[in-house]
Amino acid sequence: EAHKSEIAHRYNDLGEQHFKGLVLIAFSQYLQKCSYDEHAKLVQEVTDFAKTCVADESAANCDKSLHTLFGDKLCAIPNLRENYGELADCCTKQEPERNECFLQHKDDNPSLPPFERPEAEAMCTSFKENPTTFMGHYLHEVARRHPYFYAPELLYYAEQYNEILTQCCAEADKESCLTPKLDGVKEKALVSSVRQRMKCSSMQKFGERAFKAWAVARLSQTFPNADFAEITKLATDLTKVNKECCHGDLLECADDRAELAKYMCENQATISSKLQTCCDKPLLKKAHCLSEVEHDTMPADLPAIAADFVEDQEVCKNYAEAKDVFLGTFLYEYSRRHPDYSVSLLLRLAKKYEATLEKCCAEANPPACYGTVLAEFQPLVEEPKNLVKTNCDLYEKLGEYGFQNAILVRYTQKAPQVSTPTLVEAARNLGRVGTKCCTLPEDQRLPCVEDYLSAILNRVCLLHEKTPVSEHVTKCCSGSLVERRPCFSALTVDETYVPKEFKAETFTFHSDICTLPEKEKQIKKQTALAELVKHKPKATAEQLKTVMDDFAQFLDTCCKAADKDTCFSTEGPNLVTRCKDALA
C-alpha cells in the first residue's frame, strides 16, 4: 500500500542499523571516489531526516521519493564536477532520469587500489575501539569497488566479518584465526559479486522477462515439488527484488527480500521440505541460507516431458493461446527434472524448444515437425558436459595455478588484443572454477562450472565494453547471455592479430619480486606468460612450458642467491635470450 512517507516506511521496516548500512552502500556504489567520512556524514544526515519523518510523516519533504531525497543529497556534494566529471551533469536532470544517469555512470572497474587487509593486531584494535565505524569502512570499501553488489547480501557478509572478528580478536593467535576465515568470506563475497553483476546485466540488457526465465529455471531445480503457480509467484517476487537492487533502490530491495524470505518460511509445505533450518535463523542469515538452500528431493512419479510438450496434439494450440505461460511451463517441467543441468543450458533448451515451435507450428503438419525436438537437444547437452569433463580432467592434472595458465594461454590466443591485466584477471577467475566445482559430486559439476564461467565471462564483456579491442570478444558479448559461454569456448586463435614485438623490458625482473606474496608472484609470472603468447600466438604448449619452467627456475635461483640484485641483473638477460631462442 502507499505510504505518506516512503523514507519513514523503510526506516520502520528495516530498523536503524540496516537502514544506515543500506544507505551507505547506496551512496558508495553511486559515488565511488568519495571517502568513507564524506559518505558517513551524508548517511547520518539522511538517517536523522528519516527519524523526523518517522515522528511526523507530514513534516517537510517527508513525502518525497527516495530517489529524490538521495539524489538531492548526492548532488549537494561539494566539488562534484572536479571529482566526478560528467557524472555531475546528472544533477541537471529530474527524476527518474537523474537516477538512470547515476546508474549509467557506475564504474565496474574503478581505479581504486586493491582493498588491503590490515594486519591482525591493528584490525582488532580498530574493531574493538569502534565496531560500527569498522563495519562501515568494510561496507564502503566493498560497495565502491563492486557497484552492483547485492546490498542485503553485503550486509550479511559484514555480519559474518563482525562475527569472525569478535571471535578471533579474543584469541591469542589472532592472525591464524582471522586469515583463513576472512579469506573464506572474501572468496564467497567475490563470487557473489560476479553472480549479482550477471543478474543485473541480464536485467539491463534483456529486461525482466529474461531474468524471470532465469529465476523460473533456478527455482524449479531447487524446489521440484512446488507447483508451477508457486514457482511463478517466487520468480515474480525474486525478479522484483533484483530489479530494485540493480536499479539502486536498495531499501526497497532489502525490504522486499525480507518479505520474500518470510513468505517462503510461512509456506514451506508448498515450496520445499528443506527450508526449516534456514527459517530458524535471524533475517540476514535466513535470506542468505534460502538463496543457496539444497535442492529438494525430486518427486518420484514425474511423467516423461514428451507427454505434454511433444506427443500432445494440442501443443501448437496451447502455444498460441498463451506463449509465455506455455514456454514457462516447459522450462519449469524440464528444470525440475534436471538439477544436474546449468541454468544457462536449461535456458538454451527452452530457446531451442521455442524456435522449434515457431517453425513447426507454422507448418501444415506441426506434430510431424516438432516430434524430434527432444532428440535435437542432445548436442546442446553434450557440449557443456564435454566442456566440464575436459576442463576438470585438466584441472586435476595441473592444479589451480597450472590450470589458470592453460586458460590464460587459450584466452590470450582467442583475444590477444585484450589488455594483459584483463586477461590475467579473467584467467585467474576462470581457473578458480576447478577448485570451486571439479571437486563436487558428478551431478553438481555442470551447473557449478557453467553458471560460474558465465558470470566471469559477463565481467570480461563489461570490461571490454569500456574499451572494445577484439572483434572476437565483441561478437561473443553482443549475443544473448546464455550463448556467451559456448561462443567463447568455440573461439580459436585470432588469425587477424599481428604479433607484438619482443620487448626485453617486458621480461625483465628485479629482486623485489622475491618478497611479494605468492599471489602477486603468480600474477607477475602470468603477466609474462600472456605477453609471451602475444609475441608468439602460435607457440606450442611445449614451447611455452619450456619457457615458463626456465622462468620459474630463474626466479627460484635468484631469490635464493646471497646477492639477489646481481643475480637478477646478470641472469635476467640470459633468460630473455633463452626465451627468444625457445620461441624462435
Partner: nanobody, 115 residues
Framework: EVQLVESGGGLVQPGNSLRLSCAAS????????MSWVRQAPGKGLEWVSS????????LYADSVKGRFTISRDNAKTTLYLQMNSLRPEDTAVYYC????????SSQGTLVTVSS
C-alpha cells in the same frame, strides 16, 4: 484470448458446394498452421485438412482429396474451406483448429448434405 468463429454451414443437396469461413483472433494468425476437423452425428472427430502459416503447404484426408480446398487470408486472419461435390457422408459439424489440434475449442458450423 484466442477466438475461432466458424460460419458458412447450412443445408445443401448432394453434388452442390459450400464455402466455410473461420475468423481468428487473439494470436498471430500467420505464424500458425490451421486445420479443419469434423464430427459426424454419433461419430468421433475426424481430421479433414491442414494448411501452413504461409498458405504454401496443404494436406487433405483421402476422403476429401480432389473435392475440398483449404485456403487462408492472413491479412483478414481468416481460414476457408471450399467444399465441392458434397456427399451425404460429409454431413458433420466442422471446426477450425490451431496447429495439429484435434480438440476444437469453438462452436463449429453444421453442414448437412441431404436430398
Amino acid at each position: 484470448e484466442v477466438q475461432l468463429v466458424e460460419s458458412g454451414g447450412g443445408l445443401v443437396q448432394p453434388g452442390n458446394s459450400l464455402r466455410l469461413s473461420c475468423a481468428a483472433s487473439g494470436f498471430t494468425f500467420s505464424r500458425f498452421g490451421m486445420s479443419w476437423v469434423r464430427q459426424a452425428p454419433g461419430k468421433g472427430l475426424e481430421w479433414v485438412s491442414s494448411i501452413s502459416g504461409s498458405g504454401s503447404d496443404t494436406l487433405y484426408a483421402d476422403s476429401v482429396k480432389g473435392r475440398f480446398t483449404i485456403s487462408r487470408d492472413n491479412a483478414k486472419t481468416t481460414l476457408y474451406l471450399q467444399m465441392n461435390s458434397l456427399r451425404p457422408e460429409d454431413t458433420a459439424v466442422y471446426y477450425c483448429t490451431i496447429g495439429g489440434s484435434l480438440s476444437p475449442s469453438s462452436q463449429g458450423t453444421l453442414v448437412t448434405v441431404s436430398s
